[in-house]
């Protein structure tokens, strides 16, 4: 049974004007870089893919999601060292035998040319020039993203 | 090599006044419920624990982190059906043989009375009345959280 205070709090929240603008980020936080409508955090430390996912999540952000080749190239332009790899939000789904973004969508095969195997425990990293399949347990850097622009009436229905 | 446009964008961003207030969330988004200083999203669909973690991340949020017994009880008061389980951001770390929150901290044994085994591939769910250890591959609902209050110059020191 909900306490009356909790019920009231929820009722008030749910009855609020649903078109209120949620402010979003006006500037990127310290350590983050702006790239178009996103703020990106390029880690300096290293982590396995799962820990990288969790780190972005606890920063209320997401492992990087790349829409298309153009966004990939612009992101790679921000990587200063050729030898460094960064985890992004894409890994191999064994049950669906396909590369799957952490938002649940599947990779469009034209978007990224992946070097390496598509198999269990494979996660995707990017470098300044390429996209690689790596063992998800490998400790490398990672990229978190936050949306920069205020979004009016953003709904997040239910993935 | 950064393109001149990208370099400019990054330089401008990095030279901004670093003490600008980042607004945070002023209201909870639609479908999210306010509970004290958090916004909570109780999913309607079901997912394994890993997918739930990823889903919260892509919503720029985190699987629920519960500070203490009081917060657990208040969260449980928002669950309307006794029979429904929700993943939270706590799973069993085999290497450390302990329950571990996704922010890296370990469970204080006094906080939650867990029903079920502490073993490999175990993740924690909550119901209206209890806290359960479940196989992480089980498909159940989940709870995401966002911090509600505006934070001045937040650098995410202790995510």
């Amino acid at each position: 049974q909900k306490s009356s205070i909790e019920k009231c709090s929820v009722d008030i929240q749910q009855s609020r004007n649903k078109t209120t603008e949620r402010p979003g980020l006006l500037n990127c936080p310290i350590y983050w870089q702006q790239l178009r409508e996103k703020c990106l955090l390029f880690s300096h430390t290293v982590n396995p893919w799962n820990n990288s996912l969790a780190d972005c999540s606890t920063k209320e952000s997401s492992l990087l999601l790349i829409r298309d080749k153009d966004e990939l190239i612009h992101t790679q332009n921000l990587i200063r060292d050729k030898a460094i790899l960064f985890w992004i939000g894409l890994n191999f789904s064994l049950s669906e035998k396909n590369w799957k973004w952490i938002n649940g969508s599947f990779l469009n095969s034209n978007d990224l040319e992946i070097r390496g195997d598509a198999k269990e425990n494979s996660c995707i990293s990017i470098s300044q020039t390429s996209v690689y399949s790596e063992y998800c347990s490998t400790e490398i850097r990672w990229i978190c993203q936050k949306e920069l622009t205020p979004v009016r009436n953003k709904v997040y229905p239910d993935s | 090599q950064k393109s001149s446009i990208e370099k400019c964008s990054v330089d401008i961003q990095q030279s901004r006044n670093k003490t600008t207030e980042r607004p945070g969330l002023l209201n909870c988004p639609i479908y999210w419920q306010q509970l004290r200083e958090k916004c909570l999203l109780f999913s309607h669909t079901v997912n394994p624990w890993n997918n739930s973690l990823a889903d919260c991340s892509t919503k720029e949020s985190s699987l629920l982190l519960i500070r203490d017994k009081d917060e657990l009880i208040h969260t449980q008061n928002l669950i309307r059906d006794k029979a429904i389980l929700f993943w939270i951001g706590l799973n069993f770390s085999l290497s450390e043989k302990n329950w571990k929150w996704i922010n890296g901290s370990f469970l204080n044994s006094n906080d939650l009375e867990i029903r079920g085994d502490a073993k490999e591939n175990s993740c924690i769910s909550i119901s209206q009345t209890s806290v359960y250890s479940e196989y992480c591959s089980t498909e159940i609902r989940w709870i995401c959280q966002k911090e509600l209050t505006p934070v001045r110059n937040k650098v995410y020191p202790d995510s």
């Epitope: 350590y31 | 990095q14 995410y156």
Partner: antibody, heavy 121, light 107 residues
Framework: EVQLLESGGGLVQPGGSLRLSCAAS????????MSWVRQAPGKGLEWVSA????????YYADSVKGRFTISRDNSKNTLYLQMNSLRAEDTAVYYC??????????????WGRGTLVTVSS | DIQLTQSPSSVSASVGDRVTITCRAS??????LAWYQQKPGKAPKLLIY???ALQSGVPSRFSGSGSGTDFTLTISSLQPEDFATYYC?????????FGGGTKVEIK
């Protein structure tokens, strides 16, 4: 209370070994990369070694490579530095240090009080 | 390794003075520079990170600027408690390196 507390320092002969420990409390230790930094008497700060949050990646200054080993036990919230083949120039106060953000190696916002290691015959 | 050169190595100043310390990196480190204050027998204290971000709890008389290879720490009005040694540190690449330090002494 948020703190780091080093222990294990002392007097040791050249060629000898010591193991330093750093007990962390008040923050989520397992989420952060950690470092050891040292300071010889009357000298500046010198970074010695770093370890990733999960402990699988370690890094060393050239001056200690092959002689020192950094490790951590996240279940005990403890950082270690095993120092072998010690030399007179290793004499210093050794600090453990935590970075401000979990994505960074440095920008150390939390330091221990330090433990003195003296290498002398 | 990236070398950091601090100047001056020492400076004599009076309470109320404006003090400026510079740090030059041997290669581009973007904004990955921090400044620390250290008093005798104590651990260093983080003042500035990411070149210009003031660490929580640090007085606003401290400020940092610069990017690339040239950085500056400024104390706008020196207070008695500010007499100490100041170090810059780069956080761009491993190994992490520190400048040689600048001692701020009472004139």
């Amino acid at each position: 209370e948020v703190q780091l507390l080093e222990s294990g320092g002392g007097l040791v002969q050249p060629g000898g070994s010591l193991r330093l420990s750093c007990a962390a409390s008040g923050f989520t230790f397992s989420q952060y990369a950690m470092s050891w930094v040292r300071q010889a008497p009357g000298k500046g700060l010198e970074w010695v070694s770093a370890i990733s949050a999960v402990g699988g990646s370690t890094y060393y200054a050239d001056s200690v490579k092959g002689r020192f080993t950094i490790s951590r036990d996240n279940s005990k919230n403890t950082l270690y530095l095993q120092m072998n083949s010690l030399r007179a120039e290793d004499t210093a106060v050794y600090y453990c240090a935590k970075p401000l953000d979990s994505s960074q190696w440095a920008d150390f916002d939390l330091w221990g009080r330090g433990t003195l290691v003296t290498v002398s015959s | 390794d990236i070398q950091l050169t601090q100047s001056p190595s020492s400076v004599s100043a009076s309470v109320g003075d404006r003090v400026t310390i510079t740090c030059r990196a041997s290669q581009d480190i973007s904004s990955w520079l921090a400044w620390y204050q250290q008093k005798p027998g104590k651990a260093p204290k983080l003042l500035i990170y990411a070149a210009s971000a003031l660490q929580s709890g640090v007085p606003s008389r401290f400020s940092g600027s610069g990017s690339g290879t040239d950085f500056t720490l400024t104390i706008s009005s020196l207070q008695p408690e500010d007499f100490a040694t100041y170090y810059c540190q780069q956080a761009d690449v491993l190994p992490i390196t520190f400048g040689g330090g600048t001692k701020v002494e009472i004139k």
